[in-house]
């Protein structure tokens, strides 16, 4: 719990507490912004990002964005608040412990994005269908 000597601030989005006053530790995420990538046609890739950052706000989660156009492939790794859109998309999978890439419609490029909420989870980005929970067989396994 937060001790009395730690002053409360009126508008404090740097600290998140639950009903019991427990403090939410911030996420640790890979945070290299946009870098060129060699990740292509693979079931999963490592980010090759050497920077693990403490997310600024405790509610932020890890995000990875993979983009391919006629010229290059890039991988973006950041922290982001799931209440806010990123690249105009909602982070619908923010509670996932793994970063499962989902394709998004973007004109002129192939665009995949994932979000997740375990430490450094955007270091390993997963494209493989076997992790996709829209697969009925996998759902059957999960709920058995």
């Amino acid at each position: 719990t937060i001790p009395p000597h730690v002053q409360k601030s009126v508008n404090n989005d740097m600290i998140v507490t639950d009903n019991n006053g427990a403090v939410k530790f911030p996420q640790l995420c890979k945070f290299c912004d946009v870098r060129f990538s060699t990740c292509d046609n693979q079931k999963s890739c490592m980010s090759n990002c050497s920077i693990t950052s403490i997310c600024e706000k405790p509610q932020e989660v890890c995000v990875a964005v993979w983009r391919k156009n006629d010229e290059n492939i890039t991988l973006e790794t950041v922290c982001h608040d799931p209440k806010l859109p990123y690249h105009d998309f909602i982070l619908e999978d923010a509670a996932s412990p793994k970063c499962i890439m989902k394709e998004k419609k973007k004109p002129g490029e192939t665009f995949f994005m994932c979000s997740c909420s375990s430490d450094e989870c955007n270091d390993n980005i997963i494209f493989s269908e076997e992790y996709n929970t829209s697969n009925p067989d996998l759902l059957l396994v999960i709920f058995q």
């Epitope: 639950d18 427990a22 403090v23 530790f25 403490i54 430490d119």
Partner: nanobody, 124 residues
Framework: EVQLLESGGGLVQPGGSLRLSCAAS???????RMWWVRQAPGKGLEWVS?????????YYANSVRGRFTISRDNSKNTLYLQMNSLRAEDTAVYYC?????????????????WGQGTLVTVSS
Amino acid sequence: EVQLLESGGGLVQPGGSLRLSCAASGSTFTEYRMWWVRQAPGKGLEWVSAIEPIGHRTYYANSVRGRFTISRDNSKNTLYLQMNSLRAEDTAVYYCAKQAPGEKWARRWDLDYWGQGTLVTVSS
């Protein structure tokens, strides 16, 4: 009961350096990820840096990366924060805290014990 006691704060000019210490007693220090957290006047808590108990892997907020260095001496149950190239915006009360063990992705651990904090003022 665990007790954390910070020291090393003070008044320093912009560009100067300080080294904070946090002495832990009454606990198995080596079991915990340790944090430095700061609170500027009228602002919220900012998570500055963290260090793992084994292997001593370190993490930093983007605002302090390259200027601050966290370290720990498990034999002395002490956590350190070396702060270089200090700026006015680094002015804050600095707390150390320990992160209780648990599942890595749970993310809702308690900051179960805090130090009383040490004030760092960066001003010319």
